[in-house]
Each structure stands twice: as C-alpha cells, then as structure tokens.
Amino acid sequence: SDKLYQRKEPVISSVHTKVKGIAEVTENVTEGGVTKLGHSIFDTADYTFPLQGNSFFVMTNYVKSEGQVQTLCPEYPRRGAQCSSDRRCKKGWMDPQSKGIQTGRCVPYDKTRKTCEVSAWCPTEEEKEAPRPALLRSAENFTVLIKNNIHFPGHNYTTRNILPTMNGSCTFHKTWDPQCSIFRLGDIFQEAGENFTEVAVQGGIMGIEIYWDCNLDSWSHHCRPRYSFRRLDDKNMDESFVPGYNFRYAKYYKENNVEKRTLIKAFGIRFDILVFGTGGKF
Amino acid sequence: SDKLYQRKEPVISSVHTKVKGIAEVTENVTEGGVTKLGHSIFDTADYTFPLQGNSFFVMTNYVKSEGQVQTLCPEYPRRGAQCSSDRRCKKGWMDPQSKGIQTGRCVPYDKTRKTCEVSAWCPTEEEKEAPRPALLRSAENFTVLIKNNIHFPGHNYTTRNILPTMNGSCTFHKTWDPQCSIFRLGDIFQEAGENFTEVAVQGGIMGIEIYWDCNLDSWSHHCRPRYSFRRLDDKNMDESFVPGYNFRYAKYYKENNVEKRTLIKAFGIRFDILVFGTGGKF
Amino acid sequence: SDKLYQRKEPVISSVHTKVKGIAEVTENVTEGGVTKLGHSIFDTADYTFPLQGNSFFVMTNYVKSEGQVQTLCPEYPRRGAQCSSDRRCKKGWMDPQSKGIQTGRCVPYDKTRKTCEVSAWCPTEEEKEAPRPALLRSAENFTVLIKNNIHFPGHNYTTRNILPTMNGSCTFHKTWDPQCSIFRLGDIFQEAGENFTEVAVQGGIMGIEIYWDCNLDSWSHHCRPRYSFRRLDDKNMDESFVPGYNFRYAKYYKENNVEKRTLIKAFGIRFDILVFGTGGKF
C-alpha cells in the first residue's frame, strides 16, 4: 500500500537458479541405413546451459542435422525454393530463408525436385516440424530452485527470499506454500494458465515475477517476496515473426581429417526472472 | 511529456532476439606447409552464441591458434619480452601479458630472437593484428528481429512491440517504418553515426534503446516504443584499456591420445538492448 | 545528497568486463590404473565463459567425471541409496538426487555395497567433496577490468567510468585509487570481508556495486562512480538449498564410434555488477 510519507527506493537484485531433473527421450535413430528406436537420458548438463543472470533455459525439444560438411549441395526445397533451370538461381545470392550462398546452378534435390545449388553446411538443414509430442516433455516435472538476494542501498537494507527456517524439500504452492522457492516447471505453467505439453513443442518464454513491497519502518516491518507467473512470448504470433523460442548451436568435430558439425535446433522454455518492488522508510 | 497528476511506474521488460544472415569468409589456410585461399560459410550457429537476456553477440572477425598442447615452449616475443640469458627469466613468474608460467630458462623463439620459456598452451598465441578488413564484414547485412514484452504491474498493463497488424518482411527505418522491429545491423550503425566496416575489425558494443513513454489513461491512451541507437564502447580508448570487444574461447579435442585445443579470439559486436520508460495513469 | 528541487532520473547502464590471469593447477591424474601428479595451465579460455551483460564467472574448482557413456550401471551409493534386494528399486523411478532412471534391479556397486541399477550416463558421478584447497585458488590474483557506460536519457547525458586521464596499469584501492576500474579478485573479497581461499572451494556470488550519484547542474556538476562490494550468496545456507555456486557442463566426443562425454562440475565465483544511481538536474 502507498505510504506517502515514506521515502521509496527501487530494489537492487541478484538471482541464482538451479534446475533439477532427468528426462528419458525415445526417438528414431538411423544408423547404417537401419532405423531403430533409441532411448537416451538427458540430465542438466545435456538440456540446460551455464547461464548468468536473470534467465535460465530448459531444452524441451530438438531437431538434429548430423554430419554436416562445408561443400556444395542442393538447398532444401521449401515452399517457393524449387527451380527448373539455372535462370532461377542467382550466383552469390543469399536468400535470408536459405542456409547458403547460391552458385547459380539448378540441380536435382531428389527424384522429382530440383533446387538451387548452394555453398553451405551440407546436407542443408531440413525444414521439418518440431517433433510432437516434444522429446523432453517430461521436463514438466523438473524443478528449479530460485535464490534471490535484494538490497535497498539507500536504506542500507539487505535480505533474501530463502530464510533459515525454510525446508529444502518444499515445493511452491500459491496457497499452501507461497514462500517456498522451489518451483515445479509444470506448476509455473499451470499458474500462468498455460499448457506445458503444448508450449514444449515450439518453445516459449515464461516470466517469473518476484515482487518485493517492503515496509522498512521498524514498527511495521514487512519484507517478503510475492511470486507470480505470466507467459512472455506471443502464442498467437504470425509465422513470419518466429513464434515460440528456439536457437541453433553446433558441435564441431573432425572425421578422417574433414571438419564436420552436428547442428542442433533447440526448442525450449526460457524463464525470465523479473524482480521489482520498492523499499519504503519514514 | 510529464503529466504531474499521473501515478508513474517504471517498465518491467523481457527481450527476445533472433539474428538472420549468412557470411562467406575467405582467408588464407595453411595445411602441411602449403598456404592456399579457403572459402567457408558462417551461419547463425557459427557466428553467434545461445545467449539470454538483453544482449546478443555477432562475431565479425577472429584469430585462430590451432592445435595447442599443454607443454613447454618459448613465449611470444612481444615488445619487451625478449631475453638474452636465463637471468631475465624468473621461474614461476606469470606476466599478466604472457600466456604461461615461466620456467626460468631463456630459449630460442626463432633464428634471431630468444624469449623466456613458459609452461603453457603451446605454441602460444601470436599477438597479431585482427584481420583487416574483418573476415565477416558482410555481417553488415544480417538482420535482427527484436521482440519486447513489457509490463506495468501496478497498472496491471501488458503489451509488446510487435502488433498483429505488422508485416514480417519489413525493415526498420526511422522515417518510413519506425515501428518495424526487424533491424539491419548496418542500419543500426548508420543511425548511430558509426562505420560498421571499421568497428567490425576490433569489435564494439552497440546500444539499442527502446523507450516506452506510456499514457495509460483510457481517454488519451498511447503506448508504443521508440527506438534509438548509440555506441557504448569508447572508440578513443587507450590500448591499455582493451579497445573494441573480443573474447577468447576454446574447442577441445583429442588427437593420438593427446589433449589439444583450438583457441579462437573472437571479435564482434555485442548489442545491448536497453529498455526504459514509464507508464502513467491518473 | 537529496536536492529536492532537482528532477531525478534513474541510470541506464551497459557493462563490459575483461578478466586476466593464468592459473597453474596440480592434481592427481589416473591413466591406465596408474595415478600420478599432473600439472596444467588454465588461461581465460579455460576458466571463464563468453558471457554477456552484468555478470562474469571465474572457475575456481572442479570435479570431473570422464568417459561417461549412456548405458546401465549401479547408481552412486550416497546416504540412503543402498539396497539389498530388487524390492527397494522401482522401475522407471527418477530420484531427484540420482543421476538416472531406475531399472528395478538391485546390483553390486562394489565388494560390500549394492545400489539400484539406473539407465544413465555411466559411471554415474561420484558425490565427492570439492577439492580442498581449491584447484584454481591462485585466481585470487586474477584481475578484472570493468568498463561501464551510463546514460540519463531524459537529461541527454552520457558518461563512462574510464576517463582518458586514467592509467591502464592501475589497481583499484579504496583509499589510494578509488577511481581505478581494474580490480584484483582477492581485493574485492577482502573489501567485502570475505576469504577468497575459502569461498573458492564451493564457489559463491560476489556483488560489485557501482553507484552513480550525479548532479548534472552545470554550476555544481559531479558524476563519478563509487565502487563497493558485498557477498550475494548465503554462506550459512542449509545443504538442501545448494550452498556456494556451481554448475555442470559437458564435453561430448566419439571414441570407437561410441558417444561419450566428460562431465565437469564447475565451482567458481559469479561476479554480478550492480549499477544504480540517479542523475538530478534543476
């Protein structure tokens, strides 16, 4: 509540997060032309990245392009990319949608289709849909511990969201345990009115808001956080504005003295921790 | 404009960026003692890194030190580093400019020069100039899509910079399309009065400021972003304070059971997205 | 000091950091069943990560799990994890403390102990103490250069912490050189009343606060930063809330066509640079 007689000061904040959980992933794996069902385990080192600050990322889905090499090859025949003669292909042209630089030649992509040849990491990434259901859909059961240290320098006051009295095996619940700072990812989505299983396919951005409304007067001292959750990406976004949340990264290696890479298009949830509030004192 | 009767509240913001573009890089490549011209393609997975929050990085130049191994070798003969006898070399000494720990011996670096031997990743990194022109100078034509979700919790108001009516093939222009949130990197530099080709050599930091001056009163509601650009690193900085923007990272591998690494000194532009402003309501 | 007649505006800030230093690490290395003392050199590419924004991380300690493969194996016999029969092991169960998914079988871990078999990266990570003293304890002598560009858009005023008159070989000292922006890590800890050697074992979070109290009136203009330091993680934290600061990351590779990884549990100091303050003008 607004106490107009108080001197208000915005919060200075530092956040530390720790994700826990294991996912079992089942997917089709092709080796030597034979496709079979492969099972693998993903732990924190596999699905999250060493990140600083007020964000953490959990990979929930992926598409791999294995064994890419820098060479010439036909580009992927996405909508509008096919050609029938070299006239359609412009030497040196980089289509923003494409993955390489055109050589000017129209070459066979497969039995029925021809596309412009490109200088690129080959074979070029297939523009296939993200797997549905998401490969790491069980990330819904992962938990995140959020540690938040806050400071009102003008009032020379410091505190944190985790108190010595707290129980490390708690799970946040809006009603039963609103001060617990261990959150189940699925619960965060539920609180925000979102469906984890659905968002996990294409990825998204979820905001965890920590609001500190602190009365620092000794006679009515109060300074505890209030947690709330809201989705930050636009689920109704037009294709052209890249809906969801994904990024590409590569693992490079050498095979028979040839530089290769595996390209991973990682879909997932980026959690942004947004800390705000004020400290007021007479 | 300042409406003194309004209750003002600072913006809470979340940012998501997506860079697009391909660069063709031509450089001298030495293999088996033979130097020839090498062409390679860099896509987003090669020149940018999975980053969170209000920053993204685009590599525009690099220097590689390939096949480094942990062993003993002469340090690089930079200014003031040469020696004529062991007296000049102090066992256990770590010169902050050097890349290793001295053994105490003065050894030949090449036909004419001797330097202190160090325990280090060998051969030590040559302190050579960043290539000029920059290897990925064509990054000037890359584009970045910026998605910005903002919230005024006290006014319970949320909006974003991308509206459903927007066209995903637009490009920001201060006059013709000031609400488009797809920016050509070269245009950002031009708007800030900077030369991309020049900055790309040593790297730099560019600020993209998004200013929200929101009037949330229903009778005169206005809440759209205004974009502006300014260079954040000091282009006139003294050598000793490390001008430009670069960092080193390594790719580790094993060859004949020996642990090796390729060290990459990456120069590039870090773009900081600085979101600020207030929401006012009667 | 509060000048009530002034129009105050919060600071908009951008930070760039550069760490310097080399560490010599001595540790027991086991190869082919033989354990011997190994010496290695760590430079910036080995102990820090390309990070954006207002944080940087320096690895001070680590535990490695080498040559892990996805297969079945007994889980690590931590407190309460041992079994005597299959009844104790629940097929498909993922214990948050464990590193894999139980198969339902109770199998030998060693001569005397049995644990539940898991599908995991094997052998599973041993829950051993972080090495003491910390392997990179000499990081105390590393230095960090902090560049801070600030902006008061409403007053159209920009400045930075590094002035042209500054000397690039200075080291910050509260009394003798309070404007130098090159900081020895050990000094930061000393200023904050903390013991670097101790914190380096488990890791921690250290805040570097940069306070700008700017009077922008031309007749009494003053705008220089004031640096202060405080520890941000809770050193008295209960085990269940994960004291210190660490994260796991992996290096993946193929050996004899088998996908393997080395898991590194990296302990270290995350430095958060917290910039705050106001610019006031009549």
Epitope: - | - | V69, L72, C73, Y109, E117
Partner: nanobody, 115 residues
Amino acid sequence: EVQLVESRGGLVQAGGSLRLSCAASERTYSMGWFRQAPGKEREFVAGSGWDGIPTRYADSVKSRFTISRDNAKNTVSLQMSGLKPEDTAIYYCATGTSVYHYQYWGQGTQVTVSS
C-alpha cells in the same frame, strides 16, 4: 583390488570353436573380455552387466562370440565360434562399473587361430 584368473587358451583351426572362462575374487557389476594382438592396442571384445543384462559386443565378433556369466560364482565365459586367424591374440578378462568401463584386468591367456 579384484583378482581375476582366466582359463587356459589354446591353438584352434580356423572355423573352429573355443570357450574361455574367468573367475573373479569378488562380485562386480560388469565382466568382460578384451584382447591384444601382436603390435596392436588392447581392444574390447565383449561385456556383460549383472545377470547378463546388458550385453555388448565389438562389431568384429558379433554373432560369432557369446558372453555369459554366473553371478553366484562371480564367473564369466566367452564362447568363441567361427574363429578366424585375425582373432589370434592374448585375451584378458576384466571387471568394471558398466559394460563400457573396466578397472581390473587378468593376466591374459593366449589364443592362436591357425589357417
């Protein structure tokens, strides 16, 4: 430290069969076999987890060699059939923490396949 004792190897005609066995001084999760041919590095042959789950074979011996173990006796055996001259090597029994990871090796036993 685990002690391992392998059975005697022998000389076999190409196309013939041979069975190797090995006893461990204590129970371990995995037991397996490696081999080293003259002038070559030691290579993995076959491995078995607890109760024979899982099993793993080198590509070169798949469908010709079979590994089996007896948990109660802490033993493992390798049934080799369709032997080829290139199978000639010293065969080592090993124990470890998974079918990919081995810490202790026996003294080795010579197997020679003549053409």
